[in-house]
C-alpha cells in the first residue's frame, strides 16, 4: 500500500476548517473491515484520530477532527480539522495499515490576516518642519509574525530609526506595533506596510503631514 499526501503545506485560516489530504491505493476486494488508519502529530506522535476494527474511533484531539467515511473505501484517508487554531500548526502523519503498511506526513501552516494599520503621531499638533516626530503603525490579530516596511512619499524605504515589536495574545495571534522616528520635512507622506508572509497579504496605512491639519 502506498500512502500519498500533498507535498506543499496546507494553509488554513484561523477559525476555518482545513483538510489534510491523505490517500492510499486499495487492492481489489478491499473492504473497510481490513483498514487501520491512524493520524498523529509527527513530532510528539500524539494520537489525533483513528479508524480501526471497521469503524471510526473518533477524535483524540480536542474533538475537532473527522474523517470522510463515505470516501474511505475509495482510499481517501483525509482528515478534516475544524475551527483551526494557531496551536494546530505543525506536521501530521497519516499511517495506513492493511496487509501492508505505509505512512506520510503533511504540514499544516496556520495563518490569519492582519487588520488595516492604524496610524498615530506623537506629538500630534503644532508640528513644524525640523520637528522630530514618532509615527506608530499598529496592526492586529495576524499570524504568523508580520514583516513591516516603511516608505516616504516618494516610495523610498525608511529603515533607520524603526522599532518594531510583536506580541502574541492568548490565542497566539500577533499584534504588531512599529514605530518610526523621523524629522519632518516641509510636508510629507509616511506609509507603513504590514505583510503576512504566508498569505502574501499586505495591509497599508499612511499619514500625510501638510503643516495643518494632518490627514491619515
Amino acid at each position: 500500500v502506498e500512502v500519498q499526501v500533498s507535498e506543499d503545506p496546507v494553509v488554513a485560516l484561523v477559525d476555518t476548517d482545513a483538510t489534510l489530504r491523505c490517500s492510499f491505493s486499495p487492492e481489489p476486494g478491499f473492504s473497510l473491515a481490513q483498514l487501520n488508519l491512524i493520524w498523529q502529530l509527527t513530532d510528539t506522535k500524539q494520537l489525533v484520530h483513528s479508524f480501526t476494527e471497521g469503524r471510526d474511533q473518533g477524535s483524540a484531539y480536542s474533538n475537532r477532527t473527522a474523517l470522510f467515511p463515505d470516501l474511505l473505501v475509495q482510499g481517501n484517508a483525509s482528515l478534516r480539522l475544524q475551527r483551526v487554531r494557531v496551536t494546530d500548526e505543525g506536521s501530521y502523519t497519516c499511517f495506513v495499515s492493511i496487509q501492508d503498511f505505509d505512512s506520510a506526513a503533511v504540514s499544516l501552516q496556520v495563518a490569519a490576516p492582519y487588520s488595516k494599520p492604524s496610524m498615530t503621531l506623537e506629538p500630534n499638533k503644532d508640528l513644524r518642519p525640523g520637528n522630530m516626530v514618532t509615527i506608530t503603525c499598529s496592526s492586529y490579530q495576524g499570524y504568523p509574525e508580520a514583516e513591516v516596511f516603511w516608505k516616504d512619499g516618494q516610495g523610498v524605504p525608511l529603515t533607520g530609526n524603526v522599532t518594531t515589536s510583536q506580541m502574541a495574545n492568548e490565542r497566539g495571534l500577533f499584534d504588531v506595533h512599529s514605530v518610526l522616528r523621523v524629522v519632518l520635512g516641509a510636508n510629507g507622506t509616511y506609509s507603513c506596510l504590514v505583510r503576512n508572509p504566508v498569505l502574501q497579504q499586505d495591509a497599508h496605512g499612511s499619514v500625510t503631514i501638510t503643516g495643518q491639519p494632518l490627514t491619515f
Epitope: 500500500v1 502506498e2 481490513q34 487501520n36 491512524i38 506522535k45 483513528s50 496487509q99 501492508d100
Partner: antibody, heavy 118, light 110 residues
Framework: EVQLLESGGGLLQPGGSLRLSCAAS????????MHWVRQAPGKGLEWVAA????????YYADSVEGRFTISRDNSKNTLYLQMNSLRAEDTAVYYC???????????WGQGTTVTVSS | QSVLTQPPSASGTPGQRVTISCSGS????????VNWYQQLPGTAPKLLIY???LRPSGVPDRFSGSKSGTSASLAISGLQSEDEADYYC???????????FGGGTKLTVL
C-alpha cells in the same frame, strides 16, 4: 502452502556481525509487509523490526535501532536482518513473520538461533 | 517491562473456561486493536485471534477474544490439555510507532 524459512543463525562473540535470511514461499511476497520477532531463552516475544512491501517504510525497536538493518529482495522472495555490534542480550531465537491485517502476524517461520557469548 | 500487561500465569481444569487479560493504553489497544498468539512448548508462535475478536481459519471456536477501551481479553472455553501453552497479546503502539507484545501468560491445564 505458505512458508517462511529462516537461516543464518549461529554462535558469535560480542561486537560481531551476522546476517539472517528468511526465504518466503506460497504467497505473493512483494505484496506484504514483513517482521522480525525474537525470543530470548525462557523469555517472552519481542518485536525487532518491520518493513513494508516495497521497503520504503521501516520501523525498529529502540533496543536494536542503529545496530540492526531490515531489508528485502522481492525478486528473491527473501527478507534479511543484518545484525551488527551484537551484544549478549541479543541472544535469542529470531522469527521471520508475515504481516497480516490489523497489525497481526499470521505466518511464522520455525526460527533461527543466535547466541552471542564470549 | 512490556507495554501491554498480562498476568504471568493462569490455570484451569479440563472443560473449564479460562480468561486471560491484556491491559494497554489509549495509544495502543485503545487506538488500534489487539491480536493474540499461542505458543505451544518448543514451537513457533501461532496467530490465534486478530482484530480483537476474529479467528483465523483452523482456530477452534473455543477461543474467543474481546476488547473494551484500553483492555482486551482472551477466553478459552472447554479447556483441553493441548491448550497448555504461552499466550501473548500484541498491538501497534501509535505513540511509539512500534509493534508491542505483552509479557505472556503461561496457561497450565491442571
Amino acid at each position: 502452502e505458505v512458508q517462511l524459512l529462516e537461516s543464518g543463525g549461529g554462535l558469535l562473540q560480542p561486537g560481531g556481525s551476522l546476517r539472517l535470511s528468511c526465504a518466503a514461499s506460497g504467497f505473493s511476497f512483494s505484496s506484504y509487509g514483513m517482521h522480525w520477532v525474537r525470543q530470548a531463552p525462557g523469555k517472552g516475544l519481542e518485536w525487532v523490526a518491520a518493513i513494508n512491501s516495497d521497503g520504503s517504510r521501516i520501523y525498529y525497536a529502540d533496543s536494536v535501532e542503529g545496530r540492526f538493518t531490515i531489508s528485502r529482495d522481492n525478486s528473491k522472495n527473501t527478507l534479511y536482518l543484518q545484525m551488527n555490534s551484537l551484544r549478549a542480550e541479543d541472544t535469542a531465537v529470531y522469527y521471520c513473520t508475515k504481516y497480516y491485517y490489523h497489525y497481526a502476524m499470521d505466518v511464522w517461520g520455525q526460527g533461527t538461533t543466535v547466541t552471542v557469548s564470549s | 517491562q512490556s507495554v501491554l500487561t498480562q498476568p504471568p500465569s493462569a490455570s484451569g481444569t479440563p472443560g473449564q473456561r479460562v480468561t486471560i487479560s491484556c491491559s494497554g493504553s489509549r495509544s495502543d489497544i485503545g487506538a488500534t486493536t489487539v491480536n493474540w498468539y499461542q505458543q505451544l512448548p518448543g514451537t513457533a508462535p501461532k496467530l490465534l485471534i486478530y482484530q480483537s475478536h476474529l479467528r483465523p481459519s483452523g482456530v477452534p471456536d473455543r477461543f474467543s477474544g474481546s476488547k473494551s477501551g484500553t483492555s482486551a481479553s482472551l477466553a478459552i472455553s472447554g479447556l483441553q490439555s493441548e491448550d497448555e501453552a504461552d499466550y501473548y497479546c500484541a498491538s501497534w503502539d501509535a505513540s511509539l510507532n512500534t509493534w508491542v507484545f505483552g509479557g505472556g501468560t503461561k496457561l497450565t491445564v491442571l
